[in-house]
């Protein structure tokens, strides 16, 4: 199907010009705006172009058919849907002056929903001011050829089916194509017909394999906890009905009174550890998924979850041990917007006795460790069946403590 434009699993831009013109070159490569989601999959944003307000008015162009191309420097040959249906190739050549005057552009993004039943295309007009004033209709013509190898080069004119796209949100239309499960690996051929103010905009013939365009549902059950070795464990579960393994992008924003940062990581497991967590910080975490071993589209981000750490982090927070054993607690302490250096930390038991300095270890600039040797059985103190171990800054102790059960 060398006359069709293969759809890639990310956003692309369609530019439309009147017929029978000549052009020097297209102005933008590949239609991808600078921040568009790529295969590493970071952030998807489209840049709205600046329009020349002194351009041609639509009223002069009634009943004109604009032939549209995907902006691409290499792709000078632009096969059009209608012409292809009749078995011809139309090469669109456009004068760059006209291009600037009538800069009708659409962002198009298509994907197969995570339930593998619906193929969706979103068509967003970038010519916003104009389409507020005109009746705006979008139709998607599509065909799933029975067996591609035995078909003629182009499907017959009558074989295309048409869906009316829902444009209830102005400037953005949703086109839904039902795809039988058995045909997910087949090549879907389609083209867009956009009508506005009596002007028809028509896309090239596009081809896509739905199975390569799966956009999974967002991961579920995002959960966070501090581990016994002082890391933040983030875990989640894979969305249902996904027929292949996913990779995940996890991003967090760390907001504390001493630093603000955003960081992300791509993993194939459904959990990971964040080390270097800070006391007195909030962590807002989101995760999204994408096919691991082939093309696909990143899911939407999961609903953000927030985890807040205390001003003192003990790890582990509790120890249950037997008489005669040795155990250690670690602590990180933040006080009045400063991380307390580990060499300034002192440890107390039950706020009654200071633990000797000989039992301290400086693990790093900010992590202090205390070790108890050859432990005796805990003596109950009223309703408390444990000893409370406090990490303090000189003579000031935070009200939080670690629990030692012997």
């Amino acid at each position: 199907f060398n006359l069709s434009y293969p759809i890639t699993p990310w956003r692309f831009k369609l530019s439309c010009m009147p017929p029978n013109s000549t052009y020097d070159y297209f102005l933008l490569p590949a239609g991808l705006s600078k921040n568009t989601s790529n295969s590493n999959g970071h952030y998807e944003t489209a840049v709205e172009p600046k329009f020349n307000s002194s351009g041609t008015h639509f009223s002069n162009l009634s009943k004109t058919t604009f032939h549209c191309c995907f902006r691409s420097e290499q792709d000078r040959n632009c096969s059009l849907c209608a012409d292809n249906i009749e078995g011809k190739t139309f090469v669109s050549t456009v004068n760059s002056l006209v291009f600037q005057q009538i800069d009708a552009n659409w962002n198009i993004q298509c994907w197969l929903k995570g339930d593998l039943k619906l193929f969706i295309c979103y068509v967003e007009s970038l010519f916003k001011n104009l389409f507020r004033n005109y009746n705006y209709k979008v139709h998607l013509l599509y065909v799933l050829p029975e067996v591609l190898e035995d078909s003629p080069l182009v499907p017959q004119k009558g074989s295309f089916q048409m869906v009316h796209c829902n444009c209830s949100v102005h400037e953005c239309c949703e086109c839904l194509v039902p795809v039988p499960t058995a045909k997910l690996n087949d090549t879907l051929l389609m083209c867009l017909k956009i009508t506005s103010g009596g002007v028809i905009f028509q896309s090239p013939l596009m081809s896509v394999q739905p199975i390569n365009m799966v956009k999974p549902d967002p991961p579920l059950g995002l959960h966070m906890e501090i581990t016994d070795d002082g890391n933040l464990k983030i875990s989640w579960s894979s969305p249902p009905l996904v027929p292949f393994p996913l990779q995940y992008q996890v991003k967090y924003s760390e907001n504390s009174t001493t630093v603000i940062r955003e960081a992300d990581k791509i993993v194939s497991a459904t959990s990971l550890l964040v080390d270097s967590i800070l006391p007195g910080s909030s962590y807002e975490v989101q995760v999204r998924g994408k096919r691991l071993d082939g093309p696909g589209i990143w899911s939407d981000w999961s609903t953000p979850r927030v985890f807040t750490t205390q001003d003192v982090i003990y790890f582990p927070p509790k120890i249950l041990t037997s008489v005669g054993s040795n155990v250690s607690f670690h602590c990180i302490y933040k006080k009045e917007n400063k991380i307390v250096p580990s060499k300034e930390i002192v440890w107390w038991m039950n706020l009654a006795e200071k633990i000797p300095q000989s039992q301290y270890d400086v693990v790093s600039d900010h992590v202090s460790k205390v070790t108890f040797f050859n432990l005796n059985e805990t003596k109950p103190r009223g309703k408390f069946t444990y000893d409370a171990v406090y990490c303090c800054n000189e003579h000031e102790c935070h009200h939080r403590y670690a629990e030692l059960y012997v």
Epitope: T258, V259, I260, K265, V274, D275, V363
Partner: antibody
């Protein structure tokens, strides 16, 4: 005492990929973010990005599309790769440890002068 | 991104004098997120001040930082010969973290 020792080639042609590595000696490697910063000759400092021990990254958006910072926890080292270099990438490149709990840089490598020239 | 503008570009002073360096941010920076560095020729920068006013480990008390919002100041109360260098401010409250263009403190 923490020491950062960086190494990598110093001369690149336009469009090549710059590669630098930073070895960390002494102190704790775990529990910190590790960063790259550059300084064009006679100019100010520019933060490139950082990576945590667990592999989370945070990049300067102006360089993000060309930069990959990676970490090898078994060797106590982290690396910078910058693709499609141009003359504008000529600079002294520093690796640095990010102060725990802050966005400051408390230990620095010795710096590597990277020149991009055809 | 937050742009930090340092002034003056060069400060010519004699040992024993007081140096006042300014750093102005293009938008408000919480005082918790501002730092100062010293850099001598051929060397890596050295952290002096973090959180606008806290001295880093081993930094003499003649160095002090102050300010909030968009205006921050580094003061060297009595210049020692080893203090003649370039000084940079840095913000880390908004990504990307950015540095000022530097103030050179030279011997008059």
């Amino acid at each position: 005492q923490v020491q950062l020792q960086q190494w990598g080639a110093g001369l690149f042609k336009p469009s090549e990929t710059l590669s630098l590595t930073c070895d960390v000696y002494g102190g704790s490697f775990r529990g910190y973010y590790w960063s790259w910063i550059r300084q064009p000759p006679g100019k100010g400092l520019e933060w490139i990005g950082e990576i945590s021990y667990s592999g989370f990254t945070n990049y300067n958006p102006s360089l993000k599309s060309r930069v990959i910072i990676s970490i090898d926890t078994s060797k106590n080292q982290f690396s910078l790769k910058m693709s499609s270099v141009t003359a504008a990438d000529t600079a002294v490149y520093y690796c640095a440890r990010v102060t725990y709990g802050y966005g400051t840089f408390d230990y620095w490598g010795q710096g590597t002068l990277v020149t991009v020239s055809s | 991104e937050i742009v930090l503008t340092q002034s003056p570009g060069t400060l010519s002073l004699s040992p024993g004098e007081r140096a006042t360096l300014s750093c102005r941010a293009s938008q408000s920076v919480s005082s918790s997120y501002l730092a100062w560095y010293q850099q001598k020729p051929g060397q890596a920068p050295r952290l002096l001040i973090y959180g606008a006013s806290s001295r880093a480990t081993g930094i003499p008390d003649r160095f002090s930082g102050s300010g909030s919002g968009t205006d921050f100041t580094l003061t060297i109360s009595r210049l020692e010969p080893e203090d003649f260098a370039v000084y940079y401010c840095q913000q880390y409250g908004s990504s990307p973290w950015t540095f000022g263009q530097g103030t050179k403190v030279e011997i008059k």
